[in-house]
Interface confidence: low
């Protein structure tokens, strides 16, 4: 006859490991006992358990409560055992020795491999601001046995770099994602993907990119200078910018205080019926936590009477 076992038994941390050992004998042969031992290189054999055909299972004190026979029905030629709640320290070489009658003794070895699934963590880098060069957006670390694979899934353009640290029974892998921040990256997901044989599916951690920026400010409302004449109602200047976090707006006049009756409403400066005192240089100040911007415009309120007077002069001169 001969022993049937596996070269390698792979189990995930915390699961039960079935250590197979089956004697395939000729008819009439019987198994008297099966002895299980751990036989790591350079160390003496450590007994796990003894299965006796007459007296049943005896577990050594070091493995008390952790070694059991598989549930019935059991074949009398099956010497397999269950090692409950596998831990990393259980990883190693195991041997089953089978005493049979009348064929004698047989032995076989297997290797138990305990997979330690990673628990990945994602750490965002420093605050991202438009105008920075290549900047760390996030780093992702996962430790497991064997070493996990760490990659990135994103639409954002960037570069990755990985490094690995080996420990006695595991390995930690850290991958960094660097990018050049731009406002279009706002709200884009950056996902760390961790693969490992101990995981049923990839683990994914998503970080949402936030890039602080403040666009250049500009002022709208002076497109047609001829509309800015004495007596005109409803004249307004609007400050245009955008930013994240959203900016606040402030209006001042460079050449003195804002004239009375001029209304500041956020990004808009509203004028009462225009007079020449509304002529001047107006400045829109835009700011957020990231930056501030200014834009200035010159308002020149026209006097229609002056203009018509000039036209009359021109006509009479011709």
């Amino acid at each position: 006859g001969e022993l049937e076992t596996s070269d390698v038994v792979t189990v995930v941390l915390g699961q039960d490991a079935k250590l197979p050992c089956f004697y395939r004998g000729d008819s009439g042969e019987q198994v008297g006992q099966v002895a299980w031992a751990r036989v790591d290189a350079g160390e003496g054999a450590q007994e796990l358990a003894l299965l006796h055909s007459k007296y049943g299972l005896h577990v050594s004190p070091a493995y008390e409560g952790r070694v059991e026979q598989p549930p019935p029905p059991r074949n009398p030629l099956d010497g397999s055992v269950l090692l409950r709640n596998a831990v990393q320290a259980d990883e190693g070489e195991y041997e089953c020795r089978v005493s049979t009658f009348p064929a004698g003794s047989f032995q076989a070895r297997l290797r138990l491999r305990v997979l330690v699934p990673p628990l990945p963590s994602l750490n965002p880098g420093p605050a991202l601001e438009e105008g920075q060069g290549l900047t760390l957006a996030a780093s992702c670390t996962a430790e497991g046995s064997p070493a996990p694979s760490v990659t990135w899934d994103t639409e954002v353009k960037g570069t990755t770099s990985s490094r690995s640290f080996k420990h006695s029974r595991s390995a930690a892998v850290t991958s960094e994602f660097h990018l050049v921040p731009s406002r279009s990256m706002n709200g884009q997901p950056l996902t760390c993907v961790v693969s490992h044989p101990g995981l049923l599916q990839d683990q994914r951690i998503t970080h949402i990119l936030h890039v602080s920026f403040l666009a250049e400010a500009s002022v709208r409302g002076l497109e047609d200078q001829n509309l800015w004449h004495i007596g005109r109602e409803g004249a307004m200047l609007k400050c245009l910018s955008e930013g994240q976090p959203p900016p606040s707006y402030n209006w001042t006049r460079l050449d003195g205080p804002l004239p009375s009756g001029v209304r500041v409403d956020g990004d808009t400066l509203g004028f009462p019926p225009l007079t020449t005192e509304h002529s001047g240089i107006y400045v829109c100040h835009v700011s957020n936590e990231f930056s501030s911007r200014d834009s200035q415009v010159t308002v020149d309120v026209l006097d229609p009477q002056e203009d018509s007077g000039k036209q009359v002069d021109l006509v009479s001169a011709s």
Partner: antibody
């Protein structure tokens, strides 16, 4: 667990100033914004404004001329003042917390303010 | 300001149904969008942030998708506790909310 609680008078006369306080417990205001959002009866939500941990504020442009948001860090409180109120300001007023970006992960239970003479 | 157009304004559905609510922004909001659920007399609760990310404790039957100006909230296998009003909200610039979608029992 972070909790936010609004308090203040439930009735305000037209043209007066509405004043509410939001008390934050179970967490500090550091690195967060405290926002005010309102909801007129049977209607949708309207963002009023925010005060950031650094003390800076942003307001909804449509309300900016009437709104002031301030804070008392020692008491972990944020206050809202809305001046020159009219019946259109009748609403449930909520305070809410956000990170640096304007989505709100914790909300107060809301307080109904009625503007009526 | 950016306008958020939410549809439908209301819908009737049965337990077990799949419900889809859409939100359209008047300009690109770069996935800066959140979804909230509000029950009668209660404050809104964050469901999804940054268009696709489920907030802590939100059941996996909720999912968010979309980019640019078009966004969707999907509820698979509607449960009795899911009835209420849902709002989208952008946080690209001055925040504004959609008009809401009332999900009622058929």
């Amino acid at each position: 667990q972070v909790q936010l609680q609004e308090s203040g008078p439930g009735l305000v006369k037209p043209s007066e100033t509405l004043s509410l306080t939001c008390t934050v417990s179970g967490g500090s205001l550091t690195n967060y914004g405290v926002h005010w959002v309102r909801q007129p009866p049977g209607k949708g939500l309207e963002w009023i404004g925010v005060i950031w941990s650094g003390g800076s504020t942003n307001y909804n442009p449509s309300l900016k001329s009437r709104v002031t948001i301030s804070r008392d860090t020692s008491k972990n409180q944020v206050s809202l003042k809305l001046s020159s109120v009219t019946a259109a300001d009748t609403a449930v007023y909520y305070c809410a917390r956000s990170g640096k970006w304007y989505y709100f992960d914790y909300w107060g239970q809301g307080t109904l303010v009625t503007v009526s003479s | 300001d950016i306008q958020m157009t939410q549809s439908p304004a209301s819908l009737s559905a049965s337990v077990g149904d799949t419900v889809t609510i859409t939100c359209r922004a008047s300009q690109n909001i770069y996935s800066n969008l959140a979804w909230y659920q509000q029950k009668q007399g209660k404050s809104p609760q964050l469901l999804v942030y940054a268009a696709t990310n489920l907030a802590d404790g939100v059941p996996s039957r909720f999912s968010g998708s979309g980019s640019g100006t078009q966004y969707t909230l999907k509820i698979n296998s509607l449960q009795s506790e899911d009835f209420g009003t849902y709002y989208c909200q952008h946080f690209w610039g001055t925040p504004t909310f959609g008009g809401g979608t009332k999900v009622e029992i058929k």
